[in-house]
Interface confidence: medium
């Protein structure tokens, strides 16, 4: 069984205020079973940005069809970016359980927000 890797290829992404940011994340294995979640920041103060199993998350859409069982692309698009969205975003795989437990994290993608062009 292939070891799960969580691939966040962008070390950083820069987006102008008001635009959408695409944050890439793919996984290399369907195991263990469990959802993908996106967070901004790390540690106890981190903020949930997207959870595959709950919602809605009005500004967040998935780039591919995450409901398909064989899907391995969990990239997200965040619309109408504001300076408050700046930070490092982590794509994290959880192992299914009661409750789900964090299994593995991507390396993170730092989102910086540029001033809206005048």
């Amino acid at each position: 069984e292939e070891e799960l890797q969580i691939i966040q290829p962008d070390k950083s992404v820069s987006v102008a205020a008001g635009e959408s940011a695409i944050l890439h994340c793919t996984i290399t294995s369907l195991f263990p079973v469990g959802p993908i979640q996106w967070f901004r920041g790390a540690g106890p103060a981190r903020v949930l940005i997207y959870n595959q199993r709950q919602g809605p998350f009005p500004r967040v859409t998935t780039v591919s069809e995450t409901t398909k069982r064989e899907n391995m692309d969990f990239s997200i698009s965040i619309s109408n970016i504001t300076p408050a969205d700046a930070g490092t975003y982590y794509c994290i795989k959880f192992r299914k359980g009661s409750p789900d437990t964090e299994f593995k994290s991507g390396a993170g993608t730092e989102l910086s927000v540029r001033a809206k062009p005048s």
């Epitope: 890797q5 691939i7 290829p9 962008d10 070390k11 890439h24 793919t26 390396a107």
Partner: antibody
Framework: DVQLVESGGGVVRPGESLRLSCAAS????????MNWVRQAPGEGLEWVSL????????YYADSVKGRFTISRDNSKNTLYLQMNSLRAEDTAVYYC????????????WGLGTLVTVSS | ETVLTQSPGTLTLSPGERATLSCRAS??????LAWYQEKPGQAPRLLIY???SRATGVPDRFSGSGSGTEFTLTISSLQSEDFAVYYC??????????FGGGTKVEIK
């Protein structure tokens, strides 16, 4: 100017060990992920290993996993590759390569150091 | 692991001619693709990143195009210093970071 200078190559017998070094200058070494890439005689480029700027994240190619160890000393601006249990197929020029700060491509390379494994 | 296939293996052309090098990925790498030039006794040199962005100091006769699985490096008018081996590298699916097998551009 960014400079990467590899050293430590040489001729060894199968099963022996070698430690390669890469001295870096011209950039803030600790801020950049670093890689080793090799090229066997007459062959293409093969990625070997990656280490993050802090040294906390490390990856290896399957072909060297368990035999090679990448490390870095940020106080000395130096990258290392400890190569154990060397095999004939490890014969190659080993390049030290600096990653771009945003993406995982290599914006600067050293000239390489030749490792020959032969009985 | 994403496999990159470069073609042709060797391209034999005269100075002034146009060179078109191909790199095909076994799965989509979006535009996370770089091209390098390698000459004997020299360090490999980054030419193109992001499939189409020229690295600093690279002459504008070098251009890259493509996305997904099909990529092209074009040298619009070959100069004597362009005869070398060229490699593509994907940096979307990692580890491992993978390279193509290379295309040698040699003088006719």
């Amino acid at each position: 100017d960014v400079q990467l200078v590899e050293s430590g190559g040489g001729v060894v017998r199968p099963g022996e060990s070698l430690r390669l070094s890469c001295a870096a200058s011209g950039f803030t070494f600790s801020s950049y992920d670093m890689n080793w890439v090799r090229q066997a005689p007459g062959e293409g480029l093969e990625w070997v290993s990656l280490i993050s700027g802090s040294g906390e994240i490390i990856y290896y190619a399957d072909s060297v996993k368990g035999r090679f160890t990448i490390s870095r000393d940020n106080s000395k601006n130096t990258l290392y590759l400890q190569m154990n249990s060397l095999r004939a197929e490890d014969t190659a020029v080993y390049y030290c390569a600096k990653e771009n700060n945003r993406y995982r491509f290599f914006d600067y390379w050293g000239l390489g150091t030749l490792v020959t494994v032969s009985s | 692991e994403t496999v990159l296939t470069q073609s042709p293996g060797t391209l034999t052309l005269s100075p002034g001619e146009r060179a078109t090098l191909s790199c095909r990925a076994s799965q989509s790498v979006y535009t996370y693709l770089a091209w390098y030039q390698e000459k004997p006794g020299q360090a490999p040199r980054l030419l193109i990143y992001g499939a189409s962005s020229r690295a600093t100091g690279v002459p504008d006769r070098f251009s890259g195009s493509g996305s997904g699985t099909e990529f092209t490096l074009t040298i619009s008018s070959l100069q004597s210093e362009d005869f070398a081996v060229y490699y593509c590298q994907q940096y979307y699916d990692r580890p491992p970071l993978t390279f193509g097998g290379g295309t040698k551009v040699e003088i006719k």
